[in-house]
Amino acid sequence: CKAMHVAQPAVVLASSRGIASFVCEYASPGKATEVRVTVLRQADSQVTEVCAATYMMGNELTFLDDSICTGTSSGNQVNLTIQGLRAMDTGLYICKVELMYPPPYYLGIGNGTQIYVIDPEPCPDSDF
């Protein structure tokens, strides 16, 4: 296993619709053809897997049908979008990149993006 640098923004504020997008960029030492991207969430010392996708260079990322993540790739960058976020989902979202093929296997883990999620203010009751 060889180490690889992964960069991602430190802080992102999700939209009022609970959508957060950020770029995860990795310094590929070679010409990988198969890449796996995993998003991990760290909150109160607990780390959980949010979503993961394996893709072939030049192809779209394919997450599971029920995944809250979508993404696109361009060169050594992966543009990740996480949807359906609520205030309770505020936390550190860590991008993990693995170069699966061809060998050697490389692993890179970013410092994490702190995603702040603000629940929209409830609309005041109105009489019609």
């Epitope: 923004p9 802080v11 992102v12 504020l13 939209s15 997008s21 994490g112 702190q114 629940d119």
Partner: antibody, heavy 117, light 108 residues
Framework: QVQLVQSGAEVKKPGASVKVSCKAS????????ISWVRQAPGQGLEWMGW????????NYAQKLQGRVTMTTDTSTNTAYMELRSLRSDDTAVYYC??????????WGQGTLVTVSS | EIVLTQSPGTLSLSPGERATLSCRAS???????LAWYQQKPGQAPRLLIY???SRATGIPDRFSGSGSGTDFTLTISRLEPEDFAVYYC?????????FGPGTKVDIK
Amino acid sequence: QVQLVQSGAEVKKPGASVKVSCKASGYTFTSYGISWVRQAPGQGLEWMGWISAYNGNTNYAQKLQGRVTMTTDTSTNTAYMELRSLRSDDTAVYYCARVGANWFDPWGQGTLVTVSS
Amino acid sequence: EIVLTQSPGTLSLSPGERATLSCRASQSVSSSYLAWYQQKPGQAPRLLIYGASSRATGIPDRFSGSGSGTDFTLTISRLEPEDFAVYYCQQYGISPFTFGPGTKVDIK
């Protein structure tokens, strides 16, 4: 080193608007957020809101909603806070601070805004 | 809105003494999002503690933070002359981010 430098003191009449700037240096501006906090004379700190420099999304304190606008200019690494319809109780020192993963640091030196007729 | 209450309002102590400042939240706050700041007259606030217990860069180890849930504490083990100031706690886990009213530590 990481530094935030704010614009100079302002004197405004009630009903006018003020726009305070906060120029960042020493770090990747778009990787972080900028929060704005004010402090009336002899009073405590009041959080006004913040902006994510990465995507421009904002989160404002409800009491200021509709009167405040926070923006960034990523070409100059500068954040702005505009406050409209000024009242005498808006007289305060206005601070910007970098929003990190779980901290506000560092802070700008502060900008005194005086609202007086 | 999470309301933070700080006590005491003023703490009168002598250099060398231990200072214990309290910050109580009206509802539970994730310890990841609780900070303490020091402010001296005419100066901007300075971050001391973030994540309830992590010291910010360059902060002497006489400053320590602890607590979880609704009760948080800032301790200054031995007061130095430069520590006499106002201290604020802040939560930034739930919007609106809020500050406590502050505790003034002055010379006895």
